[in-house]
Interface confidence: low
């Protein structure tokens, strides 16, 4: 008939596999258990996918690579304590005192419980990585943590390459045996340990337990190094960058650890599964019971086939391994699960140009020199639509595009962003808003959804944010509806009037020119050029103030531009900012200050655009330690990757704005990335491409 | 310093109209606009309109029938007036003026009006 | 129009005592909202633009939060000379609108 196998990764749980099946038996529990003798989890898991075995015990992290490499899903749950469930919080915790947050853990003493532990390594490490507070270039996580934070305790790091700086708070038993071992003897190992080690003043920052400040504070611990100690002198360090008391876990923690669950294969039962078991808990999970499930001192061990802790277990309903694991703890695990052994040795980067490849080789020869990995390698391609072909073809790896770009990349091709360029705060050319401004002083005020009819004033055809952010935003939103695709001369016909200058007037609506003005002397109306005084941003924001349209669609930094001074000219000599306000898509307006929350769409920065299959945080730690290297325009080292000059031409792999490379954070979809109007208004244009 | 000083009636019969002059000093009425607010026990504070450096106005739509708002920058001053008051018009009114990027940063000091026979 | 509700209507609180007023919106209003106190007799008094930015020459223990529809006006340590009336103002639409106040007095 039916039987379950289970694995067992030890002699010992071999052992108490063979007893339990034996006490099912024995009991009449249906369908029959038995085991399997796996060397290792991950082993296990391959038995598990390969028929050979049905199921087994894992914990987080475990869960993650069995759902994410093997299709393997969690049925049931463990519980430990009736206050959190399925469920404990990994917490960072730093003296009341400090001022230490989130954002400046870089250089901070660190304690953790041990190497590879869940809540004192794994989360905390992979949730820096992940949100790109830590970089790791070549999956080297342990150099990455040893040279991020200021020295630390992690017990069990001794046996490695940076024992120097990862044990190097950590002191040992009384007689300082034992330094740095992943054993008692290590005063500062395990989660008191860690917490030991922030309190007496070692460290300044523990990754431990959301009960770990609770349990051994406030008279509640016997060593006389706790005693002393108040729950209240310590804090707990938000994800928001903000700080909470030590009883707010629920809200302040860097991840929801998940209890460990029983996985399957996808094909199996996962009902049948919970009955067998919950039929064993029932008869054995309490005191005097011939077999005891959850204990494990009769075979000399801890946690043999399910936690000692565990009160009982739970059929899982969502079965799949994202869903147990919860966003937190799954986005720490992508930040820290980087196999060396799978990383390519190469990084291709596509390349557009004579000059650009003279750059990019280049860069490979700075970046081998300094041993940066994963090397990079040059491919040239056509265009950026060739390059996306060719990462799609897995040809190439990665390539950095602008917003249009990279909206094509994302949608057509499925590439994702894997690190962004940064421009200077006061640098507006590169990363903007556009917005749609209009005189405060109209006694017949209107909104954005009232603009049909009225006057407008355009920097010029196809211009970011004058013409293809706004003209796309109100055909997304209904305003504007072209007929066979034909939007010029829709927006034609929703405008009143117009000035819309153009290089190229074939064919072109006559009311799209009418409000323009041409030069001093009357010439060259319309013109897509500087002839033309309403052309450009600030020429589109004069239409607007004398009074030729109602609505000027410029960029955010237009009107302080161009008023309380800062443009001498005189039609702009009196103006000021003020006097103006912006429409927003809310139906609101606002005051031109106002620009960030009321604007049509934000121009994106650049991206690196990679296949969804490659790491992310290995092509921006590769990024990050040549930026430090390479990334200032005046460093000594042989190589500027932010400057072009050398080669006779701009923007060469990077924009030459860049001030330096930044990780994508939440933004891990071309959509997160380019920001929602952005992609509503390329969509209202790209719906009309017939 | 800036200073928003008002003058006008405090007793006005129903159905008459109301007028109250704002005259500002500190500042130019060409470069900001004055807004008037009431305050009345029933209604609390209620903006009622403004008019703007340029002489345009824009008014509460609840008042917009019985409301006009002009001004003489020569003089530095603002006229408020308001038709057909009944007894619930009664308020303090007050004329306010922004402050750059401050909503309401200065005030007049508020003229009681009492609507009675 | 937006409606600004304001909770509680009344607080009574002895002075040192630490207070936080609060303001709800009808709809999101981003951070347009303002905060002014009255006291007897006299004009409002502009305490805290833009939900969250001070105003030169208030008091540092007047602070304001809040972004969309809910926020709050804090007082550290209230002083005697705190209580009066205070009400919150959008500017995020027009007509522009008050709250109906919340009123702090002395326990």
């Known amino acids: 008939g039916m039987e379950v196998r289970w694995c067992a990764t030890s002699d010992p749980e071999q052992h108490k596999c063979g007893n339990m099946s034996e006490a099912f038996r024995e009991a009449g529990i249906q369908p029959s258990l038995l085991c399997v003798r796996g060397t290792s989890a991950d082993h296990c898991v391959q038995l598990i996918a390969a028929q050979e075995a049905d199921a087994i015990t894992l914990d987080g992290g475990a869960i993650y690579e069995a759902g994410k490499e093997h299709g393997l899903k969690p049925v049931v749950g463990e519980v430990y304590d009736q206050e959190v469930g399925t469920s404990y919080y990994a917490v960072a915790v730093v003296r009341r005192s400090s001022h230490v947050t989130i954002d400046t853990l870089k250089g901070v003493k660190s304690c953790h419980t041990g190497i590879n532990r869940t809540v004192g390594w794994n989360v905390p490490v992979g949730y820096l990585v992940e949100s790109g507070r830590l970089s790791v270039m070549g999956c080297d996580v342990l150099k990455a943590v040893s040279d991020y934070f200021g020295g630390s305790c992690v017990p069990g790091a001794g046996e490695t390459s940076y024992s120097e700086s990862l044990c190097r708070l950590c002191r040992g038993d009384s007689s300082g045996e034992g330094v740095c071992d992943k054993s008692p003897l290590e005063r500062y190992y395990d989660y008191s340990g860690a917490f030991r080690c922030l309190a007496e003043g070692a460290g300044d920052v523990a990754f431990v337990k959301h009960s770990t400040v609770l349990e051994n504070t406030d008279g509640k611990t016997l060593p006389s190094w706790g005693q002393a100690l108040l729950s209240q002198d310590f804090e707990l360090l938000c994800r928001d960058g903000s700080r909470a008391d030590v009883t707010e876990w629920r809200q302040c923690h860097l991840a929801r650890v998940p209890a460990h669950a029983v996985v399957v294969r996808a094909d199996t039962d996962g009902g049948l599964i919970f009955r067998l078991l919950n039929e064993g808990q029932r008869l054995f999970s309490h005191e005097g019971s011939s077999f005891q499930m959850f204990s494990s001192e009769a075979y000399g061990q801890k946690d043999l086939l399910f936690k000692d802790s565990t009160s009982e277990l739970v059929p899982i309903a969502t079965q799949t391994y994202e869903a147990w694991l919860g966003h937190e703890y799954l986005h720490a695990m992508k930040g820290l699960l980087c196999d060396p052994n799978r990383l390519p040795p190469y990084l291709r980067w596509c390349v557009l140009s004579t000059p650009e490849i003279q750059k990019c080789g280049d860069m490979a020869v700075a970046f081998r020199r300094q041993r940066l990995k994963p090397e990079i390698q040059c491919v040239s391609a056509k265009s950026p639509q060739h390059c996306m072909e060719r990462i799609q073809a897995e040809q190439v790896d990665a390539v950095t595009l602008s917003g249009e770009d990279i909206y094509t990349a994302g949608k057509t091709y499925g590439l994702v962003p894997a690190a962004g360029e940064h421009y200077a705060p006061e640098d507006s050319s590169n990363s903007y808003y556009v917005v749609a401004v209009v005189r405060r002083d109209s006694s017949h005020a209107f909104t954005l959804d009232e603009l049909r009819g009225k006057r407008s004033c355009h920097a010029g055809f196809g211009s970011p944010a004058g013409w293809d952010v706004p003209v796309g935003a109100l055909i997304q939103r209904g305003f504007i509806r072209p007929k066979d695709c034909d939007v010029l001369t829709a927006v034609s016909e929703f405008f009143n009037a117009s000035c819309v200058p153009v290089n190229n007037p074939k064919n072109y609506p006559s009311s799209l020119c009418a409000l323009c003005v041409g030069d001093e002397q009357g010439r060259n109306k319309c013109v897509g050029n500087s002839q033309e005084r309403y052309y450009g941003y600030r020429g589109a924001f004069r239409c607007l103030v004398e009074n030729a349209g109602d609505v000027a669609f410029v960029r955010h930094t237009t009107v302080f531009d161009n008023t309380n001074g800062h443009n001498s000219e005189p039609w702009a000599a009196e103006l000021r900012s003020e006097d103006y306000e912006l429409l927003c898509p809310n139906g609101a307006r606002a005051e031109v200050s106002q620009f960030a929350a009321c604007n049509l769409a934000q121009i994106p920065p650049h991206a690196v655009m990679v296949r969804p299959d490659t790491n992310i945080f290995t092509v921006y730690g590769l990024l990050d330690k040549a930026q430090d290297l390479f990334g200032d325009d005046h460093n000594k080292n042989g190589f500027k990757m932010f400057d072009s000059s050398n080669y006779h031409g701009q923007d060469l792999l990077f924009k030459d704005a860049t001030v330096r490379a930044v990780p994508v954070g939440e933004k891990t979809t071309y959509r997160g990335w380019l920001g929602l109007d952005y992609v509503a208004a390329l969509e209202g244009m790209s719906s009309q491409q017939c | 310093q800036v200073q928003l000083k008002q003058s006008g009636p405090g007793l006005v019969q129903p159905s008459q109209s109301l007028s109250i002059t704002c005259t500002v000093s500190g500042f130019s009425l060409s470069s900001y606009g004055v807004h008037w607010v009431r305050q009345s026990p029933g209604k609390g504070l209620e903006w009622l309109g403004v008019?703007?450096?340029?002489?345009?106005?824009d008014y509460n739509a609840a008042f917009i029938s019985r409301l006009s708002i002009s001004k003489d920058n020569s003089k530095s001053q603002v006229f408020f007036k308001m038709n057909s008051l009944q007894a619930d018009d009664t308020a303090i009114y007050y004329c306010a003026r922004r402050n750059n990027s401050a909503w309401f940063a200065y005030w007049g000091q508020g003229t009681l009006v009492t609507v009675s026979a | 129009d937006i409606v600004l509700t304001q909770s509680p209507a009344t607080l009574s609180v002895t002075p040192g005592d630490s207070v936080s007023l609060s303001c709800r919106a009808s709809q999101g209003i981003s951070n347009n909202l303002h905060w002014y106190q009255q006291k007897s007799h006299e004009s409002p008094r502009l305490l805290i633009k833009?939900?969250?930015q001070s105003i030169s020459g208030i008091p540092s223990r007047f602070s304001g939060s809040g972004s969309g529809t809910d926020f709050a006006l804090s007082i550290n340590s209230v002083e005697t000379e705190d209580f009066g009336m205070f009400f919150c103002?959008?500017?995020?639409?027009?007509?522009?609108?008050f709250g109906a106040g919340t009123k702090l007095e002395l326990k």
């Open positions: 103002q959008q500017s995020n639409s027009w007509p522009l609108t």
């Open positions: 008019i703007w450096s340029g002489g345009n106005t």
């Open positions: 833009y939900a969250s």
